[in-house]
């Protein structure tokens, strides 16, 4: 969490932001919260990216204005205009791409004074595996499967039942370039699985960290899976 | 409400250049959180996006016109200008202009259209 | 570019049928997909954006739904001025590319 204070002239108020990741291709949101105005003629919004010379989004007298807008950013942001009332300048940002990683700054202006707060964003690519019993092989196999990852991620296989084994040896993981020549699909593949267990297999890069789980018994397969952000920290 | 009027030559000589304005009514092209855009149809066929421009000024093209394509824009006429440069008889369509969102960017309303005829 | 394949390119509904559209992108364009209704003679309208938010003025018994590059069109009741022809278009990236159509018909 970020939490920045105005300067000089008017009085400061408090902005606050939060680091964030987004999934290149799909679309993101950088999070900013300042304190409100009754007026929302009164409330200027302005988010600029380090390194870029126009703005990445303007938002005043109650309405977009993207004259100085960068090129990089045309027809991909807006704010949620019926939420500045209440404080909200988070900006909805189209097809995250990698070079929308960067720091940011959300700067505010209000009838009560001017604030600002930066912002980390990371961008990278993250999706949920699919862990499935590899019928196909000549053994009690499992084969876990993510579409979308970048930058290329580290893959762990645990189990429940041997906690703290090293499954290296017996798994093999691979990467398979995507057709945007960007992201990858993970592929591990464990081998000599024992049934009554759950077996996990855990992808992570600098950006996002996935689990999927697996539970196979003679009488049935249950499957889990989760996703976490790494490293959301207000500002 | 909001309302877009196309006006311009109904036949172009090949090799000439296709000149059409969009009369925006109802509302204003400063308006800041639009862009002004102009689709194109031709006879029988589907739709195609030529491009956009912002009150600023600032334009973005489809590729595949970008060597032949200018959008314009006059604020104190509330109009904004599209013209087609070396055109033959396959940019005959109707030519429809539209307010586009900055974001989400759907087009809504639409100029009633315009049928420009390519032919000697 | 990204290209938007619509299906079927025609369809007969009988009017009071619920008639289902298609439209498939190349490539993924998260929610960023509008769907638009054209009569003979007369500009395309705005049914949909955000892949399923309807437009201001727009009946109920129109709904989008989908995310990615599958996204379907549904008109739950057909009337009688329902039958046109309905593009998608994403708007995803540039160049904004439409869907070559489905002409809805009283079968």
């Known amino acids: 969490l970020i939490i920045g204070f105005g300067i000089s002239g008017r009085h400061s108020i408090t902005v606050t932001t939060v680091a964030s990741a987004g999934n290149i291709g799909e679309d993101g949101i950088l999070s900013c919260t300042f304190e409100p105005d009754i007026k929302l003629s009164d409330i200027v919004i302005q988010w600029l990216k380090e390194g870029v010379l126009g703005l990445v989004h303007e938002f005043k007298e109650g309405k977009d204005e993207l004259s100085e807008q960068d090129e990089m950013f045309r027809g991909r942001t807006a704010v949620f205009a019926d939420q500045v009332i209440v404080g909200n300048a988070s900006l909805r940002l189209k097809n995250v791409q990698l070079t929308d990683a960067g720091t940011y700054k959300c700067y505010i202006i209000t009838s009560k004074g001017k604030g600002n707060a930066n912002l980390e964003y990371k961008t990278g690519a993250f999706s949920m595996p699919e862990v499935n019993v590899d019928y196909n092989a000549s053994s009690e196999t499992l084969r876990c499967e993510a579409p979308r990852w970048f930058p290329q991620p580290t893959v762990v296989w645990a189990s429940q039942v041997d906690q703290g084994a090293n499954f290296s040896e017996v798994s093999n993981t691979s990467f398979e370039l995507n057709s945007e020549n960007v992201t990858m699909k993970v592929v591990s593949v464990l081998y000599n699985v024992t049934i009554n267990n759950t077996y996990s297999c855990m992808i992570e890069n600098d950006i996002a960290k996935a689990t999927g789980d697996i539970k196979v018994t003679e009488s049935e397969i249950k499957r889990r899976s989760h996703l976490q952000l790494l490293n959301s920290k207000a500002s | 409400q909001l309302q877009l009027q196309e006006s311009g030559p109904g036949l172009v000589k090949p090799s000439e250049t296709l000149s059409l304005t969009c009369t925006v009514s109802?509302?204003?092209?400063?308006?800041?959180?639009?862009?002004w855009g102009w689709i194109r149809q031709p006879p029988g066929k589907g739709l195609e996006w030529i491009g956009n421009?912002?009150?600023?000024?600032?334009?973005y093209y489809n590729p595949s016109l970008k060597s032949r394509v200018t959008i314009s824009v006059d604020t104190s006429k509330n109009q904004f200008s599209l013209k087609l440069s070396s055109v033959t008889a396959a940019d005959t369509a109707v030519y429809y202009c539209?307010?586009?969102?900055?974001?989400?960017?759907?087009?809504?309303?639409w100029g009633q259209g315009i049928l420009v005829t390519v032919s000697s | 570019e990204i290209v938007m394949t619509q299906s079927p390119a025609t369809l007969s509904v009988s009017p009071g049928e619920r008639a289902t559209l298609s439209c498939r992108a190349s490539?993924?364009?998260?929610?960023?997909l509008a769907w638009y209704q054209q009569k003979p003679g007369q500009a395309p309208r705005l049914l949909i954006y955000?892949?399923?938010t309807r437009a201001t003025g727009i009946p109920a018994r129109f709904s989008g739904s989908g995310s990615g590059t599958e996204f379907t069109l549904t008109i739950s009741s057909l009337q009688s001025e329902d039958f046109a022809v309905y593009y998608c278009?994403?708007?995803?990236?540039?160049?904004?590319?439409f869907g070559g159509g489905t002409k809805v018909e009283i079968k």
């Open positions: 539209a307010r586009e969102g900055s974001y989400p960017n759907q087009f809504d309303p």
């Open positions: 109802g509302g204003s092209i400063k308006s800041g959180s639009y862009y």
């Open positions: 421009i912002y009150y600023s000024g600032s334009t």
């Open positions: 490539q993924s364009v998260s929610s960023n």
């Open positions: 955000g892949a399923s």
């Open positions: 278009q994403q708007y995803h990236s540039f160049p904004f590319t």
